[in-house]
Interface confidence: low
Amino acid sequence: MKVLQEPTCVSDYMSISTCEWKMNGPTNCSTELRLLYQLVFLLSEAHTCIPENNGGAGCVCHLLMDDVVSADNYTLDLWAGQQLLWKGSFKPSEHVKPRAPGNLTVHTNVSDTLLLTWSNPYPPDNYLYNHLTYAVNIWSENDPADFRIYNVTYLEPSLRIAASTLKSGISYRARVRAWAQCYNTTWSEWSPSTKWHNSYREPFEQH
């Protein structure tokens, strides 16, 4: 048994880091493997993560961590019984993938303006809370070409657009994701999408 693709890990910079790797053949990750991780700090204790299968030869482990700070560095040891398969390290602040925003809502009752709001996935005491920017994806269920991305570079988790910039009388979906420039993070996963029926009064044509 051996590692074909070494573990790579990303941190949500709050409480969970996710590590993925591939073995050289089909593996029952949860019964055959253990990932030990330990904060490189005096008197810190080692923790064990039981991996799950992620495809035939793939494994994934969700490492529970206390509040992360930028200096944190973890040692990682991947064991199969008494055999050490791989040894590495992981600095969460250098491999951040933010949590996905939640509670995406489309408010359609504000005259002819659409107001999209969502929740910041971090509590106010987390460093990323005040450092997230967002991308909002809106698309038509009827027309695959009607697909647009709005970059929200301010901190407020909301977006206002004129309803008339979208077609009237058809259904749209929206989703949102986040990233933080300060840690050069990857994008978060997309939030669950929300659907609404776009309708607004066409202005009378002037003749």
Partner: antibody
């Protein structure tokens, strides 16, 4: 420090055999894959194959299968690339590197010149 | 096999500028298994990025990778004199293949 040190440059004639080496240090050599990559003069990188030194499990690129042999001696932390019969078209720099997917670090390269 | 096509072949820029190097795959690269390397004349390649966007140890944060599926990008945010070199992308989702390279030269 993780390091891969390769054997020196070789000048050979077509039809001759050759074995070049790659010695690993600073990490657990036996349980890390080692890959070989070819770079012909002025050209890009071509993946040749990989070996797992602990049990000599070997995987080849279809382009190099049957053309070269990859082997390892885990007792001395060394991987090898072997030709039975060299051709002029084998003239290139050959790199070893740690890993099976991405490669890091790399050896310094071995220049193999095949000319009559 | 997955063929990787890098563009442009040669990119001429001044120090301080932003460089954007493209790598397009002939079919989708599974799980974003894509890496980038830098190679200077007479030297071995050096790993910059793996997993599409994870920087290797010791790589400055001016280097960043992005993309998914068949389109991937290496961005160098502010070019330093030592960044002028050859760059290769490499996929490892289905066997291993390299792109043909992009040469980044001083304008």
């Amino acid at each position: 420090e993780v390091q891969l040190v390769q054997s020196g440059a070789e000048v050979k004639k077509p039809g001759e055999s050759l074995k070049i080496s790659c010695k690993g240090s600073g990490y657990r050599f036996t349980t890390n894959w080692i890959g070989w990559v070819r770079q012909m003069p002025g050209k890009g990188l071509e993946w040749m194959g990989i070996i797992y030194p602990d049990d000599s499990d070997t995987r080849y690129s279809p382009s190099f299968q049957g053309q070269v042999t990859i082997s390892a001696d885990k007792s001395i932390n060394t991987a090898y690339l072997h030709w039975n019969s060299l051709k002029s078209s084998d003239t290139a720099i050959y790199y070893c590197a740690r890993g099976a997917n991405w490669f890091d670090p790399w050896g310094q390269g071995t220049l193999v010149t095949v000319s009559s | 096999e997955i063929v990787l096509t890098q563009s442009p072949g040669i990119l001429s820029l001044s120090p301080g500028k932003r460089a954007t190097l493209s790598c397009r795959a002939s079919q989708s690269v599974s799980s974003n298994f894509l890496a980038w390397y830098q190679q200077k004349p007479g030297q071995a390649p050096r790993l910059l990025i793996y997993g599409t966007s994870s920087r290797a140890n010791g790589i400055p944060d001016r280097f960043s990778g992005s993309g998914s599926g068949t389109d991937f990008t290496l961005t160098i945010s502010g070019l330093e004199p030592e960044d002028f070199a050859e760059y290769y992308c490499q996929q490892y989702g289905s066997s291993v293949t390299f792109g043909q390279g992009t040469r980044l030269e001083i304008k």
